[in-house]
């Protein structure tokens, strides 16, 4: 038997718009950086990329998303020092033989010149200059982004 | 006084940051249903464990993260059929030999009574009855959960 | 309760060695670098080392490089500092502290009580 | 490795009074800079960070500003529990640094 509340909350859930997103973050918290229509947290500590998307994911956040070379270049801009590298949201598909976003998208291959392997294990991380295939055990630092405004009709595809 | 939520949520709640909280959800997205003072995503479609966690993190959100049996039993009361599995945000730690939620903290033993095997690449799922261990490798549906609303000076030891 | 509590100190001859234990409790310890910090008697606060949550990256003061140890086991939610060839100036209240967020080495907001290391002969 | 370079190192002040400590590092940190109140025998406790950010539980009376190599920590109105050492510390590359301390005391 369900609760009054979880009833309602069927109810009221199936009768609103679809277009009334989550309000959307109108500032970045503290820590967060603001580069366009996202805030981006880079981390200061270091961990495996597995460790990385369960960090973000824990922040209601995801390992950043890059969209183009154009986007590549202004998030690199940020980085401060050219030695260190950060985790994003790419990571070698075995099954798929390919480069795959955590959104499920594969990489365009004229986004990111990446160095290095395509193969099991490997994920990838940026550096203020490059783009990098690395064994995703190793522990580097890592960006996790949240939206800064609500796309409005956007429809979050059937999970 | 403080009421069973409060007083058993102190690890999960642990997981997210308080300097990296968004103003909060008001309402619940669409296709997202209120569960008290979360907002929970159950996907229609399968997939692994490693990809629900990256699905969830893309929508800015976690894998669902249990408080006690009393959330337990009332997201329980959400699930429609018998027969559907869905993934939440705790995993089989080999290093640690643990059962370990998607935000660090270890499972507290009363809290979930566990079907199946405590070993490498099993996560657990939850049915309309019951909490199972499976392969991680398994494609079944996954639940994701928003916070509704920023709890004011809740420590939060994770990004 | 979130606490740390620090354990192992005690009188020590220089050149002898020590290990220090903080048993952390109350939150999600591994997703958490972790810090030692001292402070010598009458004397300022000290950074000594980190560790990151995983325990694969460590860093260390140049004062106690190639003398100190850091290490953590998450299943038991517990933070090391093994500490060889002692001197005299390594005489302080030994701190752990947990940072404020998971992605920071610092901005303590979590301390324990500390314990006391003393190096005389 | 930053300095960071704590002003004064001690202050006699009264209740009631407003005082300000500052805290100078030698290259920039942006606002990675956090403030830390001790008193003896104690662990210290956060008060301030990232340069302004109230901790929890932290009396309004006490606030940080200042980015890249200057900093303040302000008491507003100093009550009897604010006595005690003041530190500055450094969160924006490691080693982690702290500043030198200034000690806050009774006229």
């Known amino acids: 038997q369900k609760s009054s509340i979880e009833k309602c909350s069927v109810d009221i859930q199936q009768s609103r718009n679809k277009t009334t997103e989550r309000p959307g973050l109108l500032n970045c918290p503290i820590y967060w950086q603001q580069l366009r229509e996202k805030c981006l947290l880079f981390s200061h500590t270091v961990n495996p990329w597995n460790n990385s998307l369960a960090d973000c994911s824990t922040k209601e956040s995801s390992l950043l998303l890059i969209r183009d070379k154009d986007e590549l270049i202004h998030t690199q801009n940020l980085i401060r020092d050219k030695a260190i590298l950060f985790w994003i949201g790419l990571n070698f598909s075995l099954s798929e033989k390919n480069w795959k976003w955590i959104n499920g998208s594969f990489l365009n291959s004229n986004d990111l010149e990446i160095r290095g392997d395509a193969k099991e294990n490997s994920c990838i991380s940026i550096s203020q200059t490059s783009v990098y295939s690395e064994y995703c055990s190793t522990e580097i630092r890592w960006i996790c982004q949240k939206e800064l405004t609500p796309v409005r009709n956007k429809v979050y595809p059937d999970s | 006084q403080k009421s069973s939520i409060e007083k058993c949520s102190v690890d999960i709640q642990q997981s997210r940051n308080k300097t990296t909280e968004r103003p909060g959800l008001l309402n619940c997205p669409i296709y997202w249903q209120q569960l008290r003072e979360k907002c929970l995503l159950f996907s229609h479609t399968v997939n692994p464990w490693n990809n629900s966690l990256a699905d969830c993190s893309t929508k800015e959100s976690s894998l669902l993260l249990i408080r006690d049996k009393d959330e337990l039993i009332h997201t329980q009361n959400l699930i429609r059929d018998k027969a559907i599995l869905f993934w939440i945000g705790l995993n089989f730690s080999l290093s640690e030999k643990n059962w370990k939620w998607i935000n660090g903290s270890f499972l507290n033993s009363n809290d979930l009574e566990i079907r199946g095997d405590a070993k490498e690449n099993s996560c657990i799922s939850i049915s309309q009855t019951s909490v199972y261990s499976e392969y991680c490798s398994t494609e079944i549906r996954w639940i994701c959960q928003k916070e509704l609303t920023p709890v004011r000076n809740k420590v939060y030891p994770d990004s | 309760e979130v606490q740390l509590l620090e354990s192992g100190g005690g009188l020590v001859q220089p050149g002898g060695s020590l290990r220090l234990s903080c048993a952390a409790s109350?939150?999600?310890?591994?997703?958490?670098?972790m810090s030692w910090v001292r402070q010598a008697p009458g004397k300022g606060l000290e950074w000594v080392s980190a560790?990151?949550?995983?325990?694969?990256?460590?860093y260390y003061a140049d004062s106690v490089k190639g003398r100190f140890t850091i290490s953590r086991d998450n299943s038991k939610n517990t933070l090391y500092l093994q500490m060889n060839s002692l001197r005299a100036e390594d005489t302080a209240v030994y701190y752990c502290?947990?940072?404020?967020?998971?992605?920071?080495?610092?901005?303590?907001?979590?301390w324990g009580r500390g314990t006391l290391v003393t190096v005389s002969s | 490795d930053i300095q960071l370079t704590q002003s004064p190192s001690s202050v006699s002040a009264s209740v009631g009074d407003r005082v300000t400590i500052t805290c100078r590092a030698s290259q920039g940190i942006s606002s990675w800079l956090a403030w830390y109140q001790q008193k003896p025998g104690k662990a210290p406790k956060l008060l301030i960070y990232y340069a302004s950010s109230l901790q929890d539980g932290v009396p309004s009376r006490f606030s940080g500003s200042g980015s890249g190599t200057d900093f303040t920590l302000t008491i507003s109105s100093l009550q009897p529990e604010d006595f005690a050492t003041y530190y500055c510390?450094?969160?924006?590359?490691?080693?982690?640094?702290f500043g030198g301390g200034t000690k806050v005391e009774i006229k």
């Open positions: 109350g939150f999600a310890f591994s997703t958490y670098a």
């Open positions: 510390q450094q969160a924006s590359v490691l080693p982690i640094t």
């Open positions: 560790i990151s949550g995983v325990g694969g990256t460590t």
């Open positions: 502290a947990k940072p404020l967020d998971s992605s920071l080495w610092a901005d303590f907001d979590l």
